[in-house]
Each structure stands twice: as structure tokens, then as C-alpha cells.
């Protein structure tokens, strides 16, 4: 055919434009050319060409008269996607082909599973709330928006905000909770995520705090305690930070902690908690419980010897604890705990109130007061301190036989041994867990020879009983262990005299040092039942005023007691023990003194030595008769110095046959001491004394000489 | 008219290897998934895997990993599958299928039986 | 893997009767299940597709529904044509269920 002038080549006036349209859809792809002849389309997908209607009437694309590409409905599944790509349409005649732009169907798609539905918040008032939602994937990328109980969020108020997939609630309220859900939507339509559920509770506040409280024992205290919260808050109590100890307290409906009876162990910090799922609140309140004050242990009247140690115990109890203080009765002077000692004092009183005074003088006889003060109330209690001679010192009571432990039945019957003896003869009394026992308690009686009786035991019974052993030359006491079951033995095994090894023989002293005492002894007479220990115990007037257990389970009959002091004299007695018990004690041996410390390490000046001793100034008492053969000599030192060991008590007959004589000497070797007793003087003679302080062989001055006669007979009262 | 037509019946012995083919006609190779499924003898389908004609990806479940290939030639418009060291319990009718744009096996192939012998 | 259990494995009726046979997915999968259709010696045939929808030139009297893990194909009066073996599969994973034999009773 030959080519006509009016004809020519196709050319495309109507581009395709790209398209997104949802799966299942109708859309169309336009493409409209000019040309003569008029030319013909086809229409090529991603470089294919596309079958239409034209090649398979079946088919869902259909080329339009106009040249464009109709879809009935666009075919899109999860991996088959035949009608998503890239289209142009070609307009072709004899003169040429036309080209189109290219243009891309998209499918539209919106999965029906939310990459992330949001899940159900619990928060407090006042907090944010977050509730997180990815969409489902689809194309194009969907958008969200929230509802509220199916009505959809307005985001214009403040406290709401909604990026990114998030809807932030800034400070919630009540009114948030309820049921939220996301909505993913695009041109394919919306899809509901599942709903979560927002709860707003409210932490714990208190309408009520507990307050602290001031009370009397035994007087009733409540501590109130009112909360509100959502949910309801459980409320708690706790003692200083522990839970409550049982039985005590009673915690009533609207959560007030009352105690019946204070004691001073419910002293404390109390603290009510208020907890709910999102808080915990706490609110504190301290008791305290005001207790008068009352004696633990009395100070009792006592007989000491001049120059040796009395201490008066004075023990108190009291919230708070009470200051304890002494005065002699007639004195203006107070005595108080951990006060300085003054310089020429001799009296102290111990933490714990104990009043001790060292060195008796007979001055020092009186009453002795001892007052216990606090915010509720006061005590006293007087004792009397009588001054004997020098030769009535008498060691503390001896307990013969003593309590053992046992453990017995309830219901059953406990006899708590307690044989003493002494000169004087001792008081026995009893104490449990420290405190005087029987009191009140008609099943508890303490029998002619000090035995303890306790009759119709009951579990409560059981503790520490200690037998006291009290005389005014001091006190011995010993413990036992009382255990109440429901299985032990009805009654107390009540062991025979004969059940019990021997006493030992009169200890010997083998050995002395500065620190210890080597003693020897025999077992019990032949006969007796075997040892198979023994126990060694000790007493000095100036260690304490009772026997003390120096040494346990000793195999041996020869044994070194150390960890004495220097410079001391002390009496020693040996029990012997088998499994039944323990056996009298032996005879007490003689009085044995520990060697002195030694002169301290060499190196010293020597003159300032000699410079600061000579500038010691010893002011001698008027001596005193105590006997026709003993003297009391007493002085005091006008500054102490650094170096001085001892004094030296210089004395001379100067009357009778051996009329100045030469000087007899006793050393007073410790640098506190200020008195001495010379002893073996001769009756109805004059003697001169003096005393003069020393440093290894370095010699102060001597005092002022004095001169006393010692009596024919003794002194008359 | 939309058809799969696939290769005939096929014996092989234990151990050898065995390759079908499924050739398309009537619609575009491309744009559709192309996906094997076999039945041994008195039993169930048993899907073996897909292939993406358009650019050749494949997946195929545990059981058949390593010792199943699928392969396509787009200029013939022809699906294959390759199975190989093949066993008795082998034997089947392996079918070929297209999934359609709703995720459907809409048009499938007449079948080619394998019968593993020795 | 998306596991899927056919009941019954077969069921004996007559012509007329209202037929229902159940597929359960071991998780949720959405709507993403089809039915086929077996006769011996024949390709399977697509019936329903996306749990719910009838492929083009399916007689009416087959429906399907059900949505999640639960499925249901029904077929409201049987004729004799519609005894074969009938197969349900899940689209995510592509595993097909152990089919039910529908007999003439």
C-alpha cells in the first residue's frame, strides 16, 4: 500500500498515570493516541505483553475501544501478584510505534493482624499512660487513629497526644479507664485492633497518719491509721522495721494498732504501710514508754575491814534509764557515774551505779544513799557501811553444795539445792534470769537450808536460777539451768552426799609469779568416789567481794592459776567433780600475795628520777592502835609523780629495852596505796615512824616522824 | 484458554533422580506462583514447595530441603522439579499449580505419575 | 508449622442430605484457608477460597465459613457428582489437611 500524505505515525496524547488501588477493585490504566490510520494498542507489563479480553474472553483486564486498560478487579494475593507492575501502552500503525510513559499500578493492601495490639495498662492518678499500637502492614503505609469506648479520640486536648503509633496520655484521670482500641486505616478501609483496657488506680494516701505517742507502762496505746487508695489499699504494720511480734497487739477493722498493756520492750518506731497495685505508702510514728524507776539489785548493808574494798551495787532499771547517783548520808557531795575521779578520792561509782571505795578508813562508816531519777519518778535506797579492825577480815560466804542443771516435767516438782556457809553465817536468797525469785508465787518456796522448791511446774518456769549466798564479809552465788518439757523426770534427782567425789585436800602454793599461783593438792580421802576433775576458784578482797571459778576441768592435781593481778593476795579452794557433780570444797588455803610488777624497763633518767622524787612531799597521819600489837599508819602526797614505785613505812621502837633501835621497814608497794598496817608490835611501847617514797634505789624525803604507843590491852570501844 | 500441561509417567530406580515439567499457556508465566504437590498412592496432598517464575526464589518445607529443586524457563513459559536420591516411598503423582491472586491453587496440572522401583 | 486436622475422614451420605465437614489450624490463621475437591484419578479443583469464597463456576450449594483456627465447607443438598475426597488448606504455610471421603451411604 502506498503511504497516503494525510496519514502519519501514532503519537501518544494520553499518558497512563501511576495508580494505587485496592485489591478486588475496578480500576483503569488510560492511554489514548492519535494516528492515521488510527493506530492499534497493546498494552506490556514489566516488559510482558498483557492478555486482555481480546486474547482470552475469561480474562478480568479488558482493553478499551479507547485503547485503555480496564481491570474488573485487580488480583492481588499474599505471593501471586499478576497485575502489580510497571505499564505502557504501544499505539502502532504502518507508519511507526508509539511508546507511552511508564505507569505503576500498586495494590492497595491492609492486612487484617496488627504487628502490635495494644495490651492493658494499669497505672496511678497523675501518671502517664502509654498505649502502643503497630498497624497491620499494608500499602499505602497505614495510618492510626484511637477510640475510647467505640467513640474516637479527639488529640486536640492537651494531656493526649498520638505519634507515631503511641497515644500518650500525659496525666491521667478516673475518667481515662475504660477500653481503648486502634485503628489501622487506608484507602483500603480500617482495620480494629483487639481492645486493651486502661485502669487508672490511685496510690495510697493517708486520711490518717499515726502520731507519736508518750506513755506509762502498763497504760494502753493506740496508734490510728486511716488510708484510702484504688483498689482499697492493704494496710500493715512493723515494728523497727520487722514484722509485729505475735500475740502483743491487736489490729482492729479500720487498721488501728492498739497494745493493751505497755512494756518497755514495745518501745519503737511503729510504722503503718498502705500498699496497692501501684503504691506503697509509708507513714511512722515512734512509743515511747516511760517506765519509773526500780532496783534490779539493792545495795545491802555490809562489814569491811579497814583498808580493804567495799563496793555497794545499786542497779537500776527505768525508761529512760535513770541516773543513778550516791551520797553519804550527812554529805553534801554528790557521786555520779564516770565522773573524774578527784585526786585524793577513794570513791567511784561504775556505769552500771555499782559505788566502790577502796581503802576503808573507820570515817567512812555511815549510810550511803543511792537515788535513781528520771522524767517518771524517783527512787532511793540506803545501806549502811560498818568499819570492823583489821583482823575480822573474813573471805565471802562459801556455797557448799550448789543448784545443778536439770531439765523436768510439767506438773512435776524442782528442788534447787543451795548449802552454804561462812562466818557469818550467810543469807541465802534466789534470783531468776536476775531477778529476786519466788516474789509472789505460792508454788515457789525456799526451804530451812536454802533449797528451792517449786511445786506444779509449768513450761514458763523455765530459765537461769541463781542461789545468792550473801553475808557482810560478801557474796557467792551460782547458777543452774532449769528446762520445763512436757517429757522431762517428775521430780529433781536428789544426788546423796555419797554420789559425790571427796573434797580435795588443803591446796599447797608450789609456785608464785607476778601473774599466777602454782597449787598442789591430794584427792578426797580413800573411800570416797573418785574425781574425774576438778575446778579451782579464788578470792581477793581487792579483785571483788565474792569466790570466783578460776579454773575448769582440771585433770591434774598440780595446776598454775594465771591472769592474777600483781601485788595481791588471794585464797584459793579445789572442787572435785564427777558426772553427778561437784563435791565440797576443800579447806582454803593459806593467803598467798603475787609477786610485784617488776621496776620498769631501764633507760630512765635518772636525774629527773631523782630531781621529781625529791620534790614529793608525804604528810603523815597521827598513826593508829588498832590492837596492842598493830598499828594503822596513813598518809597522803602532796603531787604524784611520774616515778614512784612504792612508799617505804619506816618504824623504831623508842621505849622499853631496845630503845633506838635500828629502823624495820614495810613496803607499801603500790604508788596509789596510802596506808599500812604494822602488825607483831610489841605491847605497851613507843614507837617513831615515817615513810618515804621510792623508785627502784632512787629514795625521796622522808616525812615528818611520828610517834604512837601501843596499848596493854585491847582498846575499849 | 488457561492450562498446565506437565511430562509424562517416569520409573526410575532407588537413588536416581527424577525431573518433571509443567509448561503454562493462556495467562502470563510471571505473574503468578508456580507450586508442586504430590500423592503417594491411597494417601493425602503433600505440598512440595513454590517457585517465583519471575525471578526464579523457591521454598520448600523441612522434609524436602536438599534433595528438591525447581527450576523455570521463562522464554517457554515451563516449570520444572528435580527430585533427587529418590526412595520406594517416592512414588506419586506429582502435581504442578498455579496460585492465583487469592491465594488459591486455581489451575493445576493433569499429573505425572513417578514410580520408584528397583 | 501450621499443622491441620480434617474431620471425619470420611462420612457416608445420601443424595440430598446437608453435608458439613471441619478443619482446625493448630494456631490462628486468620482467613486463610481453601477447599479443594478430588475425584480418583483427577486433579484436585479449587471450591472455596479465603474460607468463604465460591470460585468462579462452583455450584452454590458449596459455601464455606469459619475464621481464626476454626472451618467449616458445607454442601447443602449432595448430588451425586459431589462424592469425591475433599481437602482443606491453609494459605499462609501451604499445608493441607488429611482430607474426608464423602460415600454414598
Known amino acids: 500500500s502506498r503511504l497516503r500524505q494525510e496519514d502519519f505515525p501514532p503519537r501518544i496524547v494520553e499518558h497512563p498515570s501511576d495508580v494505587i488501588v485496592s485489591k478486588g477493585e475496578p480500576t483503569t490504566l488510560n492511554c489514548k493516541a492519535e494516528g492515521r490510520p488510527t493506530p492499534t494498542i497493546e498494552w506490556y507489563k514489566d516488559g510482558e505483553r498483557v492478555e486482555t479480553d481480546k486474547d482470552d474472553p475469561r480474562s478480568h483486564r479488558m482493553l478499551l475501544p479507547s485503547g485503555s486498560l480496564f481491570f474488573l478487579r485487580i488480583v492481588h494475593g499474599r505471593r501471586s501478584k499478576p497485575d502489580e507492575g510497571s505499564y505502557v501502552c504501544v499505539a502502532r500503525n504502518y507508519l511507526g510505534e508509539a511508546v507511552s510513559r511508564n505507569a505503576s499500578l500498586e495494590v492497595a493492601l491492609l492486612r487484617d493482624d496488627f504487628r502490635q495490639n495494644p495490651t492493658d495498662v494499669v497505672v496511678a492518678a497523675g501518671e502517664p499512660a502509654i498505649l502502643e499500637c503497630q498497624p497491620p502492614r499494608g500499602h499505602p503505609e497505614p495510618t492510626i487513629y484511637w477510640k475510647k469506648d467505640k467513640v474516637r479520640i479527639d488529640d486536640k486536648e492537651e494531656r493526649i497526644s498520638i505519634r507515631g503509633g503511641k497515644l500518650m496520655i500525659s496525666n491521667t484521670r478516673k475518667s481515662d479507664a475504660g477500653m481503648y482500641t486502634c485503628v489501622g486505616t487506608n484507602m483500603v478501609g480500617e482495620r480494629d485492633s483487639d481492645p486493651a483496657e486502661l485502669t487508672v488506680f490511685e496510690r495510697p494516701t493517708f486520711l490518717r497518719r499515726p502520731i507519736n505517742q508518750v506513755v506509762l507502762e502498763e497504760e494502753a496505746v493506740e496508734f490510728r491509721c486511716q488510708v484510702q487508695g484504688d483498689p482499697q489499699p492493704t494496710v500493715r504494720w512493723k515494728k523497727d522495721d520487722a514484722d509485729l511480734p505475735r500475740g502483743r497487739y491487736d489490729i482492729k477493722d479500720d487498721y488501728t494498732l492498739r497494745i493493751k498493756k505497755t512494756m518497755s520492750t514495745d518501745e519503737g518506731t511503729y510504722m503503718c504501710i498502705a500498699e496497692n497495685r501501684v503504691g506503697k505508702m509509708e507513714a511512722s510514728a515512734t512509743l515511747t514508754v516511760r517506765a519509773p524507776p526500780q532496783f534490779v539489785v539493792r545495795p545491802r548493808d555490809q562489814i569491811v575491814a579497814q583498808g580493804r574494798t567495799v563496793t555497794f551495787p545499786c542497779e537500776t532499771k527505768g525508761n529512760p534509764q535513770p541516773a543513778v547517783f550516791w551520797q553519804k548520808e550527812g554529805s553534801q557531795n554528790l557521786l555520779f557515774p564516770n565522773q573524774p575521779q578527784q585526786p585524793n578520792s577513794r570513791c567511784s561509782v561504775s556505769p552500771t551505779g555499782d559505788l566502790t571505795i577502796t581503802n576503808i578508813q573507820r570515817s567512812d562508816a555511815g549510810y550511803y544513799i543511792c537515788q535513781a531519777l528520771t522524767v517518771a519518778g524517783s527512787i532511793l535506797a540506803k545501806a549502811q557501811l560498818e568499819v570492823t579492825d583489821v583482823l575480822t577480815d573474813r573471805p565471802p560466804p562459801i556455797i557448799l553444795q550448789g543448784p545443778a542443771n536439770q531439765t523436768l516435767a510439767v506438773d512435776g516438782t524442782a528442788l534447787l539445792k543451795c548449802k552454804a556457809t561462812g562466818d557469818p553465817l550467810p543469807v541465802i536468797s534466789w534470783l531468776k534470769e536476775g531477778f529476786t525469785f519466788p516474789g509472789r508465787d505460792p508454788r515457789a518456796t525456799i526451804q530451812e537450808q536454802g533449797t528451792l522448791q517449786i511445786k506444779n511446774l509449768r513450761i514458763s518456769d523455765t530459765g537461769t536460777y541463781t542461789c545468792v549466798a550473801t553475808s557482810s564479809s560478801g557474796e557467792t552465788s551460782w547458777s543452774a539451768v532449769l528446762d520445763v518439757t512436757e517429757s522431762g523426770a517428775t521430780i529433781s534427782k536428789n544426788y546423796d552426799l555419797s554420789d559425790l567425789p571427796g573434797p580435795p585436800s588443803k591446796p599447797q602454793v608450789t609456785d608464785v609469779t607476778k601473774n599466777s599461783v602454782t597449787l598442789s593438792w591430794q584427792p578426797g580421802t580413800p573411800g570416797t568416789l573418785p574425781a574425774s576433775a576438778y575446778i579451782i576458784e579464788a578470792f581477793s578482797q581487792s579483785v571483788s567481794n565474792s569466790w570466783q571459778t578460776v579454773a575448769n576441768h582440771v585433770k591434774t592435781t598440780l595446776y598454775t592459776v594465771r591472769g592474777l593481778r600483781p601485788n595481791t593476795i588471794y585464797l584459793f579452794m579445789v572442787r572435785a567433780i564427777n558426772p553427778q557433780g561437784l563435791s565440797d570444797p576443800s579447806p582454803m588455803s593459806d593467803p598467798v600475795r603475787t609477786q610485784d610488777i617488776s621496776p620498769p624497763a631501764q633507760g630512765v633518767d635518772h636525774r629527773q628520777v631523782q630531781k621529781e622524787l625529791g620534790d614529793v612531799l608525804v604528810r603523815l597521819h597521827n598513826p593508829v592502835v588498832l590492837t596492842p600489837t598493830t598499828v594503822q599508819v596513813t598518809w597522803t602526797v602532796d603531787r604524784q609523780p611520774q616515778f614512784i614505785q612504792g612508799y617505804r613505812v619506816m618504824y623504831r621502837q623508842t621505849s622499853g629495852l631496845q630503845a633506838t633501835s635500828s629502823w624495820q621497814n614495810l613496803d607499801a608497794k603500790v604508788p596509789t596505796e596510802r596506808s599500812a598496817v604494822l602488825v607483831n608490835l610489841k605491847k605497851g611501847v613507843t614507837y617513831e615512824i615515817k615513810v618515804r617514797p621510792y623508785f627502784n634505789e632512787f629514795q625521796g624525803m622522808d616525812s615528818e616522824s611520828k610517834t604512837v604507843r601501843t596499848t596493854e590491852e585491847a582498846p575499849s570501844a | 484458554e488457561v492450562q498446565l500441561v506437565q511430562s509424562g509417567a517416569e520409573v526410575k530406580k532407588p537413588g536416581a533422580s527424577v525431573k518433571v515439567s509443567c509448561k503454562a499457556s493462556?495467562?502470563?508465566?510471571?505473574?503468578?506462583?508456580m507450586h508442586w504437590v504430590r500423592q503417594a498412592p491411597g494417601q493425602g496432598l503433600e505440598w512440595m514447595g513454590w517457585i517465583n517464575p519471575k525471578n526464579g526464589d523457591t521454598e520448600f518445607p523441612q522434609k524436602f530441603q536438599g534433595r528438591v529443586t525447581m527450576t523455570r524457563d521463562t522464554s517457554i513459559s515451563t516449570a520444572y522439579m528435580e527430585l533427587s536420591r529418590l526412595r520406594s516411598d517416592d512414588t506419586a503423582v506429582y502435581y504442578c499449580?498455579?496460585?492465583?491472586?487469592?491465594?488459591?491453587?486455581?489451575?493445576w496440572g493433569q499429573g505425572t505419575m513417578v514410580t520408584v522401583s528397583s | 508449622d501450621i499443622v491441620m486436622t480434617q474431620s471425619p475422614s470420611s462420612l457416608s451420605a445420601s443424595v440430598g442430605d446437608r453435608v458439613t465437614i471441619t478443619c482446625r489450624a493448630s494456631?490462628?490463621?486468620?482467613?486463610?484457608l481453601n477447599w479443594y475437591q478430588q475425584k480418583p484419578g483427577k486433579a484436585p479443583k479449587l471450591l472455596i477460597y479465603a474460607a468463604s469464597s465460591l470460585q468462579s463456576g462452583v455450584p452454590s450449594r458449596f459455601s464455606g465459613s469459619g475464621s481464626g483456627t476454626d472451618f467449616t465447607l458445607t454442601i447443602s443438598s449432595l448430588q451425586p457428582e459431589d462424592f469425591a475426597t475433599y481437602y482443606c488448606q491453609q494459605s499462609v504455610g501451604l499445608f493441607f489437611g488429611g482430607g474426608t471421603k464423602v460415600e454414598i451411604k
Open positions: 499449580a498455579r496460585e492465583s491472586g487469592d491465594d488459591a491453587f486455581d489451575i
Open positions: 494456631q490462628s490463621i486468620s482467613s486463610y
Open positions: 493462556g495467562y502470563t508465566f510471571t505473574g503468578y506462583y
